[in-house]
């Protein structure tokens, strides 16, 4: 039984530095508790952007200081990352873990390349 995770190849952040993408997984079992982690890979460095554990049918709850928000629907998680700047451009990888009930399964997506372009500063108006 394999656990496959799909996510879009490329996403462009909007002018406010917000990027959204869907992380979809093919569940080999009937999970009631799922953990979703977003990892950023840049220059062979990996950092955890955010993580949330949720009960199937309930909302994702990220930590209060998290830059991520999200909603879930079935085996699909809609993720939004806020406050991005040009220096945050990179590969954002979705990791999904079926936490409960056992057995545990894990799947990792191929990553979404998020491009962030800092907005041009507005010219001073006289």
């Amino acid at each position: 039984k394999a656990m496959h995770v799909a996510q879009p190849a490329v996403v462009l952040a909007n002018s406010r530095g917000t990027a959204s993408f869907v992380c979809e997984y093919a569940s080999p079992g009937k999970a009631t508790e799922v953990r979703v982690t977003v990892l950023r890979q840049a220059d062979s460095q990996v950092t955890e952007v955010c993580a949330a554990t949720y009960m199937m049918g309930n909302e994702l709850t990220f930590l209060d200081d998290s830059i991520c928000t999200g909603t879930s629907s079935g085996n699909q998680v809609n993720l939004t990352i806020q406050g991005l700047r040009a220096m945050d451009t990179g590969l954002y990888i979705c990791k999904v873990e079926l936490m409960y009930p056992p057995p545990y399964y894990m799947g990792i997506g191929n990553g979404t390349q998020i491009y962030v372009i800092d907005p041009e500063p507005c010219p001073d108006s006289d």
Epitope: A2, M3, R35, K95, M99, M106
Partner: antibody, heavy 119, light 108 residues
Framework: QVQLVESGGGVVQPGRSLRLSCIAS????????MHWVRQAPGKGLEWVAV????????HYADSVKGRFTISRDNSKNTLYLQMNSLRAEDTAVYYC????????????WGQGTLVTVSS | EIVLTQSPGTLSLSPGERATLSCRAS???????LAWYQQKPGQAPRLLIY???SRATGIPDRFSGSGSGTDFTLTISRLEPEDFAVYYC?????????FGPGTKVDIK
């Protein structure tokens, strides 16, 4: 740097209990699944149990289910293994290991603590 | 439960030679979630490879992993004296996380 230090091993009679501890340092403890892996003398490696992230989810090998309990205290960066109803076949070096960023392989290991179950 | 079988049980080679270790799974290992470890007597295991082919931090490039599905290989291109040890494979795509019985690489 990442460090894992186990303690609590020793000689115990069959049917008795023992509690192992593993103190972690050098990383954000609550962001990782933490595991116990054991190795009987002259034998191979056997995964025992895992306690995930916030501590609420735990999984066990069939060989220890119902007898061993894994727990963690994230405020103390410490992982525990409560071993009850010990048997001779539980004799092994018990390693504390950190799960990896990309999944539950084991990227850092403690030095191990020896548990001997003998009458 | 995924059962892993390693072959050969023992590999007798000389320094400078190439070592090829095999790990076979009883069923497909999800997305190549397979790791390799090295263990020397009296020491804890050390992670060499994860994801079937990604080298862990600080591991020399003479160690390489390959394979997918049910068949995986660890290759040591040129054996150094410090490479003589026992090598284990492990799958981590689903619980219980299982190890192979190990391959001992000893000096011929």
């Amino acid at each position: 740097q990442v460090q894992l230090v186990e303690s609590g091993g020793g000689v115990v009679q069959p049917g008795r209990s023992l509690r192992l501890s593993c103190i972690a340092s050098g990383f954000t403890f609550s962001s990782y699944g933490m595991h116990w892996v054991r190795q009987a003398p002259g034998k191979g490696l056997e995964w025992v149990a895992v306690n995930w992230y916030d501590g609420s989810n735990k999984h066990y090998a069939d060989s220890v289910k119902g007898r061993f309990t894994i727990s963690r205290d994230n405020s103390k960066n410490t992982l525990y293994l409560q071993m009850n109803s010990l048997r001779a076949e539980d004799t092994a070096v018990y390693y504390c290991a950190r799960g990896g960023v990309w999944g539950p392989y084991f990227d850092y290991w403690g030095q191990g603590t020896l548990v001997t179950v003998s009458s | 439960e995924i059962v892993l079988t390693q072959s050969p049980g023992t590999l007798s080679l000389s320094p400078g030679e190439r070592a090829t270790l095999s790990c076979r799974a009883s069923q497909s290992v999800s997305s190549s979630y397979l790791a390799w470890y090295q263990q020397k007597p009296g020491q804890a295991p050390r992670l060499l490879i994860y994801g079937a082919s990604s080298r862990a931090t600080g591991i020399p490039d003479r160690f390489s992993g390959s394979g997918s599905g049910t068949d995986f290989t660890l290759t040591i291109s040129r054996l150094e004296p410090e490479d003589f040890a026992v090598y284990y494979c492990q799958q981590y795509g689903s619980s219980p996380f299982t190890f192979g019985p190990g391959t001992k690489v000893d000096i011929k």
